[in-house]
C-alpha cells in the first residue's frame, strides 16, 4: 500500500526530518509549512493549524522560503554615484552598483555600500595599477624616457619619441619635440607599449594588473565628476 501523504501540521516520525519547504516548530513539535519568498509568518503553527503567511510590506523582502515573523528591510536608496541594478521587491533586496569612473570602497554582501571616485594620475604620472571594482588606481612617476601629458585614471606612461635632432627634450610630462621629419619611438626601460583598440574615437587603454606580462587592452571609459588628480608626491 502507498504511504499516506501527511498534510501540515503533522508530527514527524522519530528520527526523521520535515520535508522540503517545511520546518519543525519546537513549540508545537510539528512539521509546519514555510512561507514562500515575498511572504513571512504572520501566525505560527499549532498542533491543529498550519502557519499563516502574509505578504511582505513595502520596502521589505524575503528571498527564501522562511518562517520569519517579519520581512527584512531593503537597503537604503542608491546614491548619485551608484546605479540601482536590482530593485527592492517583496522577494529581493535592492542592489546598488558603482557607476563608471568609481570603485567600491565599502562592499556589501551584494553590491556596494560606498563608492569612491577613481584616482586620476596627473601629468608626469601614469597608471601603475588600474582600478578594479574594489580598488583604486595606483599612479607612479613616469620613468626617465617616458611621459604622460594627461590627467587620467587610465593612461600609462608612454615612451618619448627619439629624434634625429631634438628641438625640445622630453620630460616626465611632455614628449620630446623633434626637428627631424621621421622620429621614432624609444624602447626605454620601463616604457609600456599597448596595442591601440580599433576605433575612430579616442580610446583609453588599461594595463593588466600583472607586472610581469605585457599589458593588453580593455575598454574602460570613466565618467562622473573628476576626482582630485594624483599629487606630485606620486603616492
Amino acid at each position: 500500500l502507498p504511504a499516506q501523504v501527511a498534510f501540515t501540521p503533522y508530527a514527524p516520525e522519530p528520527g526523521s526530518t520535515c520535508r522540503l519547504r517545511e520546518y519543525y516548530d519546537q513549540t508545537a513539535q510539528m512539521c509546519c509549512s514555510k512561507c514562500s519568498p515575498g511572504q513571512h509568518a504572520k501566525v505560527f503553527c499549532t498542533k491543529t493549524s498550519d502557519t499563516v503567511c502574509d505578504s511582505c510590506e513595502d520596502s521589505t523582502y524575503t528571498q527564501l522560503w522562511n518562517w520569519v515573523p517579519e520581512c527584512l528591510s531593503c537597503g537604503s536608496r542608491c546614491s548619485s554615484d551608484q546605479v540601482e541594478t536590482q530593485a527592492c521587491t517583496r522577494e529581493q533586496n535592492r542592489i546598488c552598483t558603482c557607476r563608471p569612473g568609481w570603485y567600491c570602497a565599502l562592499s556589501k554582501q551584494e553590491g556596494c555600500r560606498l563608492c569612491a571616485p577613481l584616482r586620476k594620475c596627473r601629468p608626469g604620472f601614469g597608471v601603475a595599477r588600474p582600478g578594479t571594482e574594489t580598488s583604486d588606481v595606483v599612479c607612479k612617476p613616469c620613468a626617465p624616457g617616458t611621459f604622460s601629458n594627461t590627467t587620467s585614471s587610465t593612461d600609462i606612461c608612454r615612451p618619448h619619441q627619439i629624434c634625429n635632432v631634438v628641438a625640445i627634450p622630453g620630460n616626465a610630462s611632455m614628449d620630446a619635440v623633434c626637428t627631424s621629419t621621421s622620429p621614432t619611438r624609444s624602447m626605454a626601460p620601463g616604457a609600456v607599449h599597448l596595442p591601440q583598440p580599433v576605433s575612430t574615437r579616442s580610446q583609453h587603454t588599461q594595463p593588466t594588473p600583472e607586472p610581469s606580462t605585457a599589458p593588453s587592452t580593455s575598454f574602460l571609459l570613466p565618467m562622473g565628476p573628476s576626482p582630485p588628480a594624483e599629487g606630485s608626491t606620486g603616492d
Partner: nanobody, 118 residues
Framework: EVQLLESGGGLVQPGGSLRLSCAAS????????MGWFRQAPGKEREFVAS????????NYADSAKGRFTISRDSAKNTVYLQMNSLRPEDTGVYYC???????????WGQGTQVTVSS
C-alpha cells in the same frame, strides 16, 4: 581580460525600433551584472538597463521602462537591448558595461551611435 563590442546602432525614425548587441569575450559572462548606458551630446553618461545572471533579473531607468528590453544569451556570450517606440531624446552613444561582482561597472565597450530623427 574582458572585452565588449557593441553593434546595431544607426539612424531610425521616431517611433521606430533598433536592437543593439554586445558581444563579450574573456571572463565577462561570469559577470553578475551586464548593463547598457547611454551618453547624449553634451550630457553625462546615464544608466539605461541592467540584467543579472543567473536569474535574469532586469532593472530599467524610468526613461526606458515599457519601451526597452534587456536580454542575455549566454550561449552566444551576447547581451541585447531591444529598443521600441524610439524618441529623438533617445539619441546618443550606447555603451555596454560589465560589473563582474556587481560592485562596480568597470569594463566598457567602445559604444554604438543611435540617432532618432525624421
Amino acid at each position: 581580460e574582458v572585452q565588449l563590442l557593441e553593434s546595431g546602432g544607426g539612424l531610425v525614425q521616431p517611433g521606430g525600433s533598433l536592437r543593439l548587441s554586445c558581444a563579450a569575450s574573456g571572463r565577462t559572462f561570469s559577470s553578475l551584472f551586464m548593463g547598457w548606458f547611454r551618453q547624449a551630446p553634451g550630457k553625462e553618461r546615464e544608466f539605461v538597463a541592467s540584467i543579472r545572471y543567473p536569474g535574469l533579473i532586469t532593472n530599467y531607468a524610468d526613461s526606458a521602462k515599457g519601451r526597452f528590453t534587456i536580454s542575455r544569451d549566454s550561449a552566444k556570450n551576447t547581451v541585447y537591448l531591444q529598443m521600441n517606440s524610439l524618441r529623438p531624446e533617445d539619441t546618443g552613444v550606447y555603451y555596454c558595461a560589465a560589473a563582474p561582482t556587481g560592485r562596480a561597472f568597470n569594463y566598457w565597450g567602445q559604444g554604438t551611435q543611435v540617432t532618432v530623427s525624421s
